[in-house]
Amino acid sequence: ARNGDHCPLGPGRCCRLHTVRASLEDLGWADWVLSPREVQVTMCIGACPSQFRAANMHAQIKTSLHRLKPDTVPAPCCVPASYNPMVLIQKTDTGVSLQTYDDLLAKDCHCI
Amino acid sequence: ARNGDHCPLGPGRCCRLHTVRASLEDLGWADWVLSPREVQVTMCIGACPSQFRAANMHAQIKTSLHRLKPDTVPAPCCVPASYNPMVLIQKTDTGVSLQTYDDLLAKDCHCI
């Protein structure tokens, strides 16, 4: 069950997809990736207030217990609900290959 | 790829499974659940330092970008990698039913 998409903290403050531009050097990939030289990394960033985009029952429990015991139980966290695949041209022992990665770019986000 | 399980912050400080005892009242379930009266909730709590239990490539990217842009990109977060099912005896319009929930109790944890 994916709960409310209304952010009580104000527009753009809650868990959502952000794009961060990163070079191969930023990612620590320069020694094994040839292309792309720069990646538009999509990632999940933002707060997870009560029931906002709750991924499942566990997220709802976490919200309840965080309210009761904020020092013990953290609030739910904004993480990818699914991913977009991406290819990298990477160096191999003998040359290059084109490799697909299915878990690299966030496609959409939820709180868990 | 699940990376290192050695916690550089000291024993028990990094992302791992914790058990939190919670009553139906704590969980806000008292009006629709009859049993159990108390749940041993397993949840994922702890820090996610560099490459600790990195769930996938996305988590590794997040670590790299958090190091570069800590104010923009959060560190990876400790969340369930899988769940244990649990049954609840719940009230219905006509009486009670036994319902299985697959996404309630964390089974193991990773950083994402």
Partner: antibody, heavy 118, light 107 residues
């Protein structure tokens, strides 16, 4: 495995529009970094890059042909279409489509011969 | 547009010989040159990426080198299945452009 197949009319009359379709399998045009390109080869001559389209719908065209070209994709059908308007005999060629990963064109279709003649 | 000029247009050789093909770009393309092989009636096969990187599955007798404007493609010991036309292509900037091709034929 990756496969691409070009389809087209075979014969087109001068001044008409040539429509080609590339149907592919083994990869997705929703994957970041993936594109499909078109290349042609007149009989007995060399290769000429025509156009390509990327996963994000960015499009690039051969400078000399740009005004006559249209390229589009249907991600759900795994197809890329190319239209070349106002054809002349000089457009007679084998037309290939190729999978692209950034600037690599690693898998090619078998090609389809298009003859422009009245 | 960047013009790619290949030489020679035809090269006659025997199995076991070393073959070298030259490709010159009309402007600096860094190392962004690829090489393809095409046999009669077949589509081109991708061999070399970014001047010197062999693509997956390409035998190590094929190699490439160069940067800037001057590039070289080498077959260290030609096999019977290597007789074909070879094309260079710049992938530095669009529009991507090919050289005119070099036909490697049996002497």
């Amino acid at each position: 495995q990756v496969q691409l197949q070009e389809s087209g009319p075979g014969l087109v009359k001068p001044s008409e529009t040539l429509s080609l379709t590339c149907t592919f399998s083994g990869f997705s045009l929703s994957t970041y970094g993936i594109g499909v390109g078109w290349i042609r080869q007149p009989p007995g001559k060399g290769l000429e890059w025509i156009a390509h389209i990327w996963w994000n719908n960015n499009k690039y065209f051969n400078t000399a042909l740009k005004s006559r070209l249209t390229i589009s994709k249907d991600t759900s059908k795994n197809q890329v279409s190319l239209k070349l308007s106002s054809v002349t005999a000089a457009d007679t060629a084998v037309y290939y489509c190729a999978r692209m990963g950034y600037d690599i064109m690693d898998y090619w279709g078998q090609g389809t011969l298009v003859t422009v003649s009245s | 547009d960047i013009v790619m000029t290949q030489s020679p247009a035809t090269l006659s050789t025997s199995p076991g010989e070393r073959v070298t093909i030259s490709c010159k770009a009309s402007q600096d393309v860094n190392t962004a040159v690829a090489w393809y092989q095409q046999k009669p009636g077949q589509s081109p096969r991708f061999l070399i990426y970014s001047s010197s990187y062999r693509y997956t599955g390409v035998p190590d007798r094929f190699s490439g080198s160069g940067s800037g404007t001057d590039f070289t493609f080498t077959i260290s010991s030609v096999q019977s299945e290597d007789f074909a036309v070879y094309y260079c292509q710049q992938h530095y900037s669009t529009p991507w452009t090919f050289g005119g091709g070099t036909k490697v034929e049996i002497k």
